[in-house]
Amino acid sequence: SAGAGSHCQKTSLRVNFEDIGWDSWIIAPKEYEAYECKGGCFFPLADDVTPTKHAIVQTLVHLKFPTKVGKACCVPTKLSPISVLYKDDMGVPTLKYHYEGMSVAECGCR
Amino acid sequence: SAGAGSHCQKTSLRVNFEDIGWDSWIIAPKEYEAYECKGGCFFPLADDVTPTKHAIVQTLVHLKFPTKVGKACCVPTKLSPISVLYKDDMGVPTLKYHYEGMSVAECGCR
């Protein structure tokens, strides 16, 4: 898996809803692939991490003053929805096809 | 200034274009306020860091498995433009009124 020594990339992160206490309201799925953005944002920032101008500037300032300014951070830049079956306020199972922002689609340096 | 022990927030970062080698093409300004997003994304994630569902999930998984999964990261979530005067290939000064993504407007946990 990608550590701090490798460049920013999307890695697997299986999330079990019981582990995070969400099994009290999410009926299904029991777990899902959330993914995680891992790795460093090293100079020079590659196109595949879609850096903003600010991220490029911060990377250059970090090169010059590494103790004063941090590197840009590897984070989700695009998220995908999942479908979930959950209990509503009255305990009725309800299907939400598009439960937004639950899974990483793309990672980048920000 | 905000360190890793404080919560995610926008802090000052004055960038001098000479320091990053951009003075070769940016005539003015000589420096600008880029800001930096600093601090941790701690549980529970506050509304002011506008967490995505994925960031909330990752924070909860980190609580459960701190060595396996990292915390969400404090990054710019909204950027502002600045106006820059730059030299073109012929050395002619040209103005970019709306040079996007150069300064942090808002920070959040992603």
Epitope: - | A28, P29, K30, Y32, E33, S80, P81, I82, S83, L85, D88, D89, M90, V92, P93, T94, L95, K96, Y97, H98
Partner: antibody, heavy 114, light 110 residues
């Protein structure tokens, strides 16, 4: 020497159309973000819109009063900037300048009147 | 009503120092990006000052400063050829382009 020369102005009836041109020389036109700025008779300056360089997407942005009626385009092979003005109103009467922000043309007068 | 407020007129005698102010009254405008244009009678506007950059051909009698939400243009050793209109301009983030002040007509007396 940088030169911007506008042309195409004239008298047009309300609801009519006009296309302005701006011939550029003395700088790398293809890399420049180009704007149109107008000045109504006896009034101040008003930004009309801007086009980025093609290498930066060639995106256009417009001021609210002209959005949907005016279109900015560029032909880098001819070093020329254009402003297509449709559905003209009397309040569009002005001298229209093309500019890099640092350099300005001499302007061309557009009069919208019946 | 312009979001950059200038006095409609200013005057002075030859050799005097004149200051023209430009006040920001809109949060979409950052005073940092404010700059100045000169328009002499019957001519196109000309960039006078952008941050600390003065285009070649512009006299060093012109200088710009910024404080709080105001920018100022100072002209020392006033000359009859300085007569004309002076416009401040800023970057309107919402509009994604420049916005101009209403202009100040400078008259050189005597």
């Amino acid at each position: 020497e940088v030169q911007l020369v506008e042309s195409g102005g004239g008298l047009v009836k309300p609801g009519g159309s006009l296309r302005l041109s701006c011939a550029a020389s003395g700088f790398t036109f293809s890399n420049a973000w180009m704007s149109w700025v107008r000045q109504a008779p006896g009034k101040g300056l008003e930004w009309v819109g801007r086009i980025k360089s093609k290498t930066e997407g060639g995106d256009t942005d417009y001021a609210a009063p002209v959005k949907g009626r005016f279109t900015i385009s560029r032909d880098d092979s001819k070093n020329t900037l254009y402003l297509q003005m449709n559905s003209l109103k009397t309040e569009d009467t002005a001298v229209y300048y093309c500019t890099t922000g640092t350099y300005w043309g001499q302007g061309t007068l557009v009069t919208v009147s019946s | 009503q312009s979001v950059l407020t200038q006095p409609p007129s200013a005057s002075g005698t030859p050799g005097q120092r004149v200051t023209i102010s430009c006040s920001v009254t809109n949060t979409d405008i950052d005073i940092f990006n404010v700059h100045w244009y000169q328009q002499l009678p019957g001519t196109a506007p000309k960039l006078l000052f952008f941050h600390d950059y003065r285009p070649s051909g512009v006299s060093d009698r012109f200088s710009g400063s910024k404080s709080g939400t105001s920018a100022s243009l100072a002209i020392v050793g006033l000359q009859s050829e300085d007569e004309g209109y002076y416009y401040c301009a800023g970057l309107d983030e919402a509009m994604r382009g420049p916005v101009f002040g209403g202009g100040t007509k400078l008259t050189v007396l005597g």
